[in-house]
Interface confidence: low
């Protein structure tokens, strides 16, 4: 004979637990149905009647199977330095992530608590490590034979052009200037761009740049503890 299926509410066998998507109601001392995501418990179960579920109201949600009396409130609108990457629905909270050109300096469980603008490397410095959703750009001085003449969060140092006859030697922030009509070969057709990080759902990790090159996002705060690191600008 097939095993008898118990319908909720039912009293569990001593020492056993309720099944998946059921919970044990202490008052009724019965296994009762949970409410599905997007719903909440309007009326709790009794010995003779199961849980009565109702849909979450606007701007509220439940993400899991539950028996909460009220749905959770969605977070308020995203702030000006953020974009909404997940809308508030009955089954999920709103998620705000940093807008392009910014990174998350301080994460929260989902989304970001504090966005900061990506550092821009000034002339003479290039991007050593591009910014990500949760870490700032790292700048480095341009090595001999390379230059960067831009203030940018994406440009790397690029080689000086090689001249037959040099009119003005290149330096870290300027390309070489040739006297002949054309250089023997140009290694610097233009700025080399690293891609901006694609704005996707925030990773839930705390940013941990190396101390020596770590960003200062203090320019976001009224009187920050330290100026931006060398080679960077808060512009």
């Amino acid at each position: 004979l097939p095993a008898q299926v118990a319908f909720t509410p039912y009293a569990p066998e001593p020492g056993s637990t309720c099944r998946l998507r059921e919970y044990y109601d202490q008052t009724a001392q019965m296994c009762c149905s949970k409410c599905s995501p997007g719903q909440h418990a309007k009326v709790f179960c009794t010995k003779t009647s199961d849980t009565v579920c109702d849909s979450c109201e606007d701007s509220t949600y439940t993400q899991l199977w539950n028996w909460v009396p009220e749905c959770l409130s969605c977070g308020s609108r995203c702030s000006s330095d953020q974009v909404e990457t997940q809308a508030c629905t009955r089954e999920q909270n709103r998620i705000c992530t940093c807008r392009p050109g910014w990174y998350c300096a301080l994460s929260k469980q989902e989304g970001c608590r504090l966005c900061a603008p990506l550092r821009k490397c000034r002339p003479g410095f290039g991007v050593a490590r591009p910014g990500t959703e949760t870490s700032d750009v790292v700048c480095k001085p341009c090595a001999p034979g390379t230059f960067s003449n831009t203030t940018s969060s994406t440009d790397i140092c690029r080689p000086h052009q090689i001249c037959n006859v040099v009119a003005i030697p290149g330096n870290a922030s300027m390309d070489a200037v040739c006297t002949s009509t054309s250089p023997t070969r140009s290694m610097a057709p233009g700025a080399v761009h690293l891609p901006q990080p694609v704005s996707t759902r925030s990773q839930h990790t705390q940013p941990t740049p190396e101390p020596s090159t770590a960003p200062s996002t203090s320019f976001l705060l009224p009187m920050g503890p330290s100026p931006p690191a060398e080679g960077s600008t808060g512009d």
Partner: nanobody, 120 residues
């Protein structure tokens, strides 16, 4: 005009205690989540602790759990952070920040910070 003014920082020996205060004005303090955040010398931000409007729910970073206590006095619009058993790793600028509930959980208002230096 929104203002958050931290005080109570200073130099303390390892194992010592400090109590930080944050006086708030210009926004509805008593209905705002409040947070302590610190910024180390390496400029890394670290969430320390937060507290809900009525003070019943508090959360702490693992690195300070059991040593720091966050509290608030809504009548005085003041946030506190009691820091005991301080370690050299706790050296940082401590900011109080407010989420007034209209910004999707982001910290809209910041103080200017108070420096805590823990010497060995």
């Amino acid at each position: 005009d929104v203002q958050l003014v931290e005080s109570g920082g200073g130099l303390v020996q390892s194992g010592g205690s400090l109590r930080l205060s944050c006086a708030a004005s210009g926004f509805p303090f008593s209905s705002s989540d409040m947070t302590w955040v610190r910024q180390t010398s390496g400029s890394v931000f670290e969430w320390v602790s937060d507290i809900n409007p009525d003070g019943q729910n508090t959360r702490y970073a693992d690195s300070v759990k059991g040593r720091f206590i966050i509290s608030r006095d809504n009548a005085k619009s003041t946030l506190y952070l009691q820091m005991d058993s301080l370690k050299t790793d706790d050296t940082a600028v401590y900011y109080c920040a407010a989420d007034p509930g209209s910004s999707g959980g982001s910290l809209s208002y910041w103080g200017k910070g108070t420096l805590v230096t823990v010497s060995s």
